[in-house]
């Protein structure tokens, strides 16, 4: 039975050229996290964090994606094309799969303020 919930940073905005942290947190379960996958809006896999074998970043994103903090992901040198949905998928044992959604808006404006809050999708 899946008792856990995924909390995410929800809808966030950040400046073009800046960086942003995508964060998901799994709570209310004792399940063991075996792997976390981070996907972009077009179903492309950005990164994997495997419990035994560590972080793997897709080579095309290596210069702009940094692992962490924790099981989160840091996107750097943001472009307007980075706007869109991001998904964290937590594979756990024995619960199964949990999935969270974050929407990132990259703003052209130099006065854009980074906004982030944790919410349950």
């Amino acid at each position: 039975m899946m008792t856990g919930t995924i909390e995410t940073t929800g809808n966030i905005s950040a400046k073009k050229g800046g960086s942003v942290i995508l964060q998901c947190h799994l709570s209310s379960t004792m399940a063991q996290v075996t792997q976390v996958n981070w996907e972009q809006h077009d179903h492309s896999l950005l990164a994997i964090r495997n419990a035994e074998l560590g972080w793997h970043i897709y080579p095309a994103f290596k210069d702009r994606v940094a692992p962490g903090p924790g099981l989160g992901l840091t996107l750097q040198s943001l472009t307007m094309n980075d706007t869109g949905e991001y998904f964290c998928t937590y594979h756990t044992y024995p619960d199964g799969t949990y999935r969270g959604r974050i929407f990132l808006e990259v703003l052209e404006s130099s006065v854009a303020e980074h906004s982030a809050r944790f919410q349950i999708p």
Epitope: T34, Q35, I48, N50, G54, H56, T97
Partner: antibody, heavy 117, light 106 residues
Framework: EVQLVQSGAEVKKPGASVKVSCKAS????????IYWVRQAPGQRLEIIGR????????YYVDKFKNRATLTADTSASTAYMELSSLRSEDTAVYYC??????????WGQGTLVTVSS | DIQLTQSPSFLSASVGDRVTITCKGS??????LVWYQQKPGKAPKLLIY???NLQSGIPSRFSGSGSGTEYTLTISSLQPEDFATYFC????????FGQGTKVEIK
């Protein structure tokens, strides 16, 4: 052209150790992690662990945590896998392979390790 | 981790045959599936990545398809050099391999 060339076959006695080498060429050795994978007769491939040559950081599957040691010599573009306390069930072909993001794109030719008394 | 089961384990075929190999996951593989070819004493060769992307230099007679838990590798017209063992690999949950399918000459 990317190539991974492994050392030759080994025959070892139970309780001994074996060290297999994997020389990389055709790419920047420190840019990609090297995985070690083995295939015992009639069995599927199983992962032993991973080394990042850039910083020497290693990761091991639980099953091999206490017996496998992965190292890399960046000056020689060579990765090594040492397995200790060998037993008959360690008889297998051992492969080094480069991981491209999430999947393995180039493999060594394999090294047969036979454990027999 | 996801367990992968290939079928059949052995396959006898003739040159020119259309050959299909199946790889089934114990859970959703989410299209993160890869196919390799291996000949005796040789290094495995990457054929297809992410379900249906042909690796550079691989002949177009090889193709991949599938979704969810079920994936297939198809060789449209088997050539003499295609007699080999084929195995699948997934990275959606853990990094695991299928047991292999040996394609033999009929």
């Amino acid at each position: 052209e990317v190539q991974l060339v492994q050392s030759g076959a080994e025959v070892k006695k139970p309780g001994a150790s074996v060290k297999v080498s994997c020389k990389a060429s055709g790419y920047t050795f420190t840019e990609y992690s090297i995985y070690w994978v083995r295939q015992a007769p009639g069995q599927r491939l199983e992962i032993i662990g991973r080394i990042d040559p850039k910083n020497g950081r290693t990761y091991y599957v639980d099953k091999f945590k206490n017996r496998a040691t992965l190292t890399a010599d960046t000056s020689a573009s060579t990765a090594y896998m040492e397995l200790s306390s060998l037993r008959s069930e360690d008889t297998a072909v051992y492969y080094c392979t480069r991981i491209y993001g999430f999947y393995f794109d180039f493999w060594g030719q394999g090294t047969l390790v036979t454990v027999s008394s | 981790d996801i367990q992968l089961t290939q079928s059949p384990s052995f396959l006898s075929a003739s040159v020119g045959d259309r050959v299909t190999i199946t790889c089934k996951g114990s859970q959703n593989v989410n299209k993160y599936l890869v196919w390799y070819q291996q000949k005796p004493g040789k290094a495995p060769k990457l054929l297809i990545y992410n379900t249906d992307n042909l690796q550079s230099g691989i002949p177009s007679r090889f193709s991949g398809s599938g979704s969810g838990t079920e994936y297939t590798l198809t060789i449209s017209s088997l050539q003499p050099e295609d007699f080999a063992t084929y195995f699948c690999y997934q990275y959606n949950n853990g990094f695991t391999f299928g047991q292999g399918t040996k394609v033999e000459i009929k």
